[in-house]
């Protein structure tokens, strides 16, 4: 039975050219996290973080994605095209798969606020 919940940074906004931290957190379960996948709105993979083997950053993003903090991902040099949904998929044993959603809005405005609140989707 899957008892866990994924908390995410929810809806966030950041400045064009800036950076943003995409963060998910799995709670309320004793399941072991074996792997976390990060996907972009078009379902292309940004990165994989295997618990033992470390990070795999996809070549298309290698200059703009930094692993961490923790199981999260830092997206740098933001463009307007980065606006959209991001998904963290937690592969766990024995529970199975948990999935969280973050919506990122990249703003031209210099007054873009970076909200870092955690939400349960």
């Amino acid at each position: 039975m899957m008892t866990g919940t994924i908390e995410t940074t929810g809806n966030i906004s950041a400045k064009k050219g800036g950076s943003v931290i995409l963060q998910c957190h799995l709670s309320s379960t004793m399941a072991q996290v074996t792997q976390v996948n990060w996907e972009q709105h078009d379902h292309s993979l940004l990165a994989i973080r295997n618990a033992e083997l470390g990070w795999h950053i996809y070549p298309a993003f290698k200059d703009r994605v930094a692993p961490g903090p923790g199981l999260g991902l830092t997206l740098q040099s933001l463009t307007m095209n980065d606006t959209g949904e991001y998904f963290c998929t937690y592969h766990t044993y024995p529970d199975g798969t948990y999935r969280g959603r973050i919506f990122l809005e990249v703003l031209e405005s210099s007054v873009a606020e970076h909200s870092a609140r955690f939400q349960i989707p």
Partner: antibody, heavy 119, light 107 residues
Framework: QVQLVQSGAEVKKPGASVKVSCKAS????????MHWVRQAPGQRLEWIGG????????SYSQKFQGRATLTVDTSASTAYMELSSLRSEDTAVYYC????????????WGQGTTVTVSS | DIQMTQSPSSLSASVGDRVTITCQAS??????LAWYQQKPGKAPKLLIY???YRYTGVPSRFSGSGSGTDFTFTISSLQPEDIATYYC?????????FGGGTKLEIK
């Protein structure tokens, strides 16, 4: 240049254990995970498992869990693969291979170590 | 475990031919796929990573494409030195798995 140099061929009896070494040079050993892949005669490549030299974290194929042990000696930039309870089906060429920096593809391979299990 | 089905298992082609090998994953692996070349008695060599990126020093006649479950490896103009066995490899999730290989021969 990057080099992975493996220990020599081994002949073992069924039930015995074998330990294969892989000496790495030409890069920072702790920055790349090391993997072990085997190839039985005429068969496909088979992933045994991988180890992260940075923290000695290991990931094994379920098939080899409990029978294969991956270790590293970071001071000697050497990885080891020990396989126990050998059977004839373990006769194969065993390769160490590292995964690319921040990638999972396998970019450098050792020359292979032939392990023959025969009574 | 993710099964990787490679076809054909062997093929014979002439120098200068366009050669295509396919690899099918039993589930979606996005673009977490690499292709390797192995010559008899030698270790495999990385040719293509992340489905479509040519590894450093690999000739431009080698290319890869695909995502999800269906992948293609192409040699645009076969050269005598390309005679080898080619393997696909998924690293989307452990245990990492390989295709059964395609043995390429010259006609």
């Amino acid at each position: 240049q990057v080099q992975l140099v493996q220990s020599g061929a081994e002949v073992k009896k069924p039930g015995a254990s074998v330990k294969v070494s892989c000496k790495a040079s030409g890069y920072t050993f702790t920055e790349n995970a090391m993997h072990w892949v085997r190839q039985a005669p005429g068969q496909r490549l088979e992933w045994i498992g991988g180890i992260n030299p940075n923290n000695a974290g290991t990931s094994y194929s379920q098939k080899f869990q409990g029978r294969a042990t991956l270790t590293v000696d970071t001071s000697a930039s050497t990885a080891y693969m020990e396989l126990s309870s050998l059977r004839s089906e373990d006769t194969a060429v065993y390769y160490c291979t590292r995964s690319s920096y921040y990638r999972y593809d396998l970019d450098y391979w050792g020359q292979g170590t032939t392990v023959t299990v025969s009574s | 475990d993710i099964q990787m089905t490679q076809s054909p298992s062997s093929l014979s082609a002439s120098v200068g031919d366009r050669v295509t090998i396919t690899c099918q994953a039993s589930q979606d692996i996005k673009t977490a796929l690499a292709w390797y070349q192995q010559k008899p008695g030698k270790a495999p060599k990385l040719l293509i990573y992340s489905a479509s990126y040519r590894y450093t020093g690999v000739p431009s006649r080698f290319s890869g494409s695909g995502s999800g479950t269906d992948f293609t490896f192409t040699i645009s103009s076969l050269q005598p030195e390309d005679i080898a066995t080619y393997y696909c490899h998924q690293h989307y999730t452990t245990p990492w798995t390989f295709g059964g290989g395609t043995k390429l021969e010259i006609k």
